[in-house]
Interface confidence: low
């Protein structure tokens, strides 16, 4: 006769491992007992269980509730056992020794491989700012056995680099994604993809990119000079910019305080019915945590009673300050 077994048994952490050991012999042969042992190069042999044809299953207390026979129906020639809830520490070599009558004893060894699915963690890099050079956007780490594969899925242009650290029973893989930040990347997904033989499907963790920037400021509202006449109602100046984080707006008048009745509402400066007192240089200040920018305009309110006067508007230089 001979033993039917497997060279390698592979299970995922927490699954039950079936350690196969089936004696295929002549019809009149019987299996008296099957002994199972763990064979460790450092600790030597450690008995797990004895499966006796008459007295049943006897389990080493260290493996109580963990070693069982497969569910019925069972063939009397089948010495296979189930190692319940396989853990990483179970990985290694196992031996079954089969005592038969009348053919004698047989033994076989097999290796149990326990796959430890990785638990990925994604760590964003330092805050991204437009104008930086190649910068770490995020790193993704996954530890498992065997070593997991860590890659990136994104439409964003960048470079990825990986390194791994080997531990006694597992390996940790860290992949970094570097990019040159630009505002177009804002809101773009950066997904870490972890593959592993112990996973039914890839694990994915998505990080949404945020790139700090502040656009140049400009002022709208003076396009039609003829609208800026004494008595006109509803005149407004609107400051235009965009940024991440969203910028805050403020209005001042360069040549004195804002005239009475002029109201600031966010990015918009609202005027009461216009008078010549409203003529002057107005400055829009735009700022966020990254930087600040200014844009100034000169407003001259035309008095229809004074036909020699023309509305003059000048968009002056834009100023930009980094924080």
């Amino acid at each position: 006769g001979e033993l039917e077994t497997s060279d390698v048994v592979t299970v995922v952490l927490g699954q039950d491992a079936k350690l196969p050991c089936f004696y295929r012999g002549d019809p009149d042969e019987q299996v008296g007992q099957v002994a199972w042992a763990r064979v460790d190069p450092n600790e030597g042999i450690r008995e797990l269980a004895l499966l006796h044809s008459k007295y049943g299953l006897h389990v080493n207390p260290a493996y109580e509730d963990r070693v069982e026979q497969p569910p019925p129906p069972r063939d009397p020639l089948d010495g296979s056992v189930l190692l319940r809830n396989a853990v990483q520490a179970d990985e290694g070599e196992y031996e079954c020794r089969v005592s038969t009558f009348p053919a004698g004893s047989f033994q076989a060894r097999m290796r149990l491989r326990v796959l430890v699915p990785p638990l990925p963690s994604l760590n964003p890099g330092p805050p991204l700012e437009e104008g930086q050079g190649l910068t770490l956007a995020a790193s993704c780490t996954a530890e498992g056995s065997p070593a997991p594969s860590v890659t990136w899925d994104t439409e964003v242009k960048g470079t990825q680099s990986s390194r791994s650290f080997t531990h006694p029973r597992s390996a940790a893989v860290t992949s970094e994604f570097h990019l040159v930040p630009s505002r177009s990347m804002n809101g773009q997904p950066l997904t870490c993809v972890v593959s592993h033989p112990g996973l039914l499907q890839d694990r994915r963790i998505t990080h949404t990119l945020q790139v700090a920037f502040l656009a140049e400021a400009s002022v709208r509202g003076l396009e039609d000079q003829n609208l800026w006449q004494v008595g006109r109602e509803g005149a407004t100046l609107k400051c235009l910019s965009e940024g991440q984080p969203p910028p805050k707006y403020n209005w001042t008048r360069l040549d004195g305080p804002l005239p009475s009745g002029v109201r600031v509402k966010g990015d918009t400066l609202g005027f009461p019915p216009l008078t010549t007192e409203h003529s002057g240089v107005y400055v829009c200040h735009v700022s966020n945590e990254l930087s600040s920018r200014d844009s100034q305009v000169t407003v001259e309110v035309l008095d229809p009673e004074d036909p020699g006067k023309q509305v003059d508007l000048v968009s002056a230089s834009h100023h930009h300050h980094h924080h």
Partner: antibody, heavy 121, light 107 residues
Framework: QVQLVQSGAEVKKPGASVKVSCKAS????????MHWVRQAPGQGLEWMGW????????NYAQKFQGRVTMTRDTSISTAYMELSRLRSDDTAVYYC??????????????WGQGTLVTVSS | DIQMTQSPSSLSASVGDRVTITCRAS??????LNWYQQKPGKAPKLLIY???SLQSGVPSRFSGSGSGTDFTLTISSLQPEDFATYYC?????????FGQGTKVEIK
């Protein structure tokens, strides 16, 4: 039997640091991850991070990065959690919890009795 | 981060009742869901791991089910020692997160 015994209650002033210990017995200390979980008075549970006692490798919750340090001394089977720059909202019971062998990364099969840390000026 | 939401936040029941607590994850966590029991002044205790596996030593009246985003803890016949607060927790990815808890009180 598996036991995790933590150090006693602490009262600290804002801005100070606290170091809580967790002594393990009844199992192979280096064979299981150790996690730290806290619970503010009357509130739910909040995971802070883990340490792999075998390698010393750590993984901290983003919320605590820069303020928490987890270490271990394998010679005395003890894990430590140090939290710095304490604030009043750090007042909580701090637990150490063993990561199970089945799921070392996220299932806590044994817990310490907890250490009350009170932050008050 | 994955958010875990439990319902109800509290419930009143009598000894012998069948009690069901639900937990919802903000994204699919497969079966990486665990349940804990906590009594006042005590540390939490693991009841169920991997959504439905009963932790050794835990009475069989406790059972768990579900996968993906929706999970359930069931106590088939409530015993006096079961009055406590129950927490779900995901172990799909870090940071590991808990539900806000469900307090089971005596009616």
């Amino acid at each position: 039997q598996v036991q995790l015994v933590q150090s006693g209650a602490e009262v600290k002033k804002p801005g100070a640091s606290v170091k809580v210990s967790c002594k393990a017995s009844g199992y192979t200390f280096t064979g299981y991850y150790m996690h730290w979980v806290r619970q503010a008075p009357g509130q739910g549970l909040e995971w802070m991070g883990w340490i792999n006692p075998n390698s010393g490798g750590t993984n901290y919750a983003q919320k605590f990065q820069g303020r928490v340090t987890m270490t271990r001394d394998t010679s005395i089977s003890t894990a430590y959690m140090e939290l710095s720059r304490l604030r009043s909202d750090d007042t909580a019971v701090y637990y150490c919890a063993r990561g199970s062998a089945l799921h070392f990364f996220g299932v806590f099969d044994y817990w310490g009795q907890g250490t009350l840390v009170t932050v008050s000026s | 981060d994955i958010q875990m939401t439990q319902s109800p936040s509290s419930l009143s029941a009598s000894v012998g009742d069948r009690v069901t607590i639900t937990c919802r994850a903000s994204q699919s966590i497969s079966s990486y869901l665990n349940w804990y029991q906590q009594k006042p002044g005590k540390a939490p205790k693991l009841l169920i791991y991997a959504a439905s596996s009963l932790q050794s030593g835990v009475p069989s009246r406790f059972s768990g089910s579900g996968s993906g985003t929706d999970f359930t803890l069931t106590i088939s016949s409530l015993q006096p020692e079961d009055f406590a607060t129950y927490y779900c927790q995901q172990s799909y990815s870090t940071p590991l997160t808990f539900g806000q808890g469900t307090k089971v009180e005596i009616k």
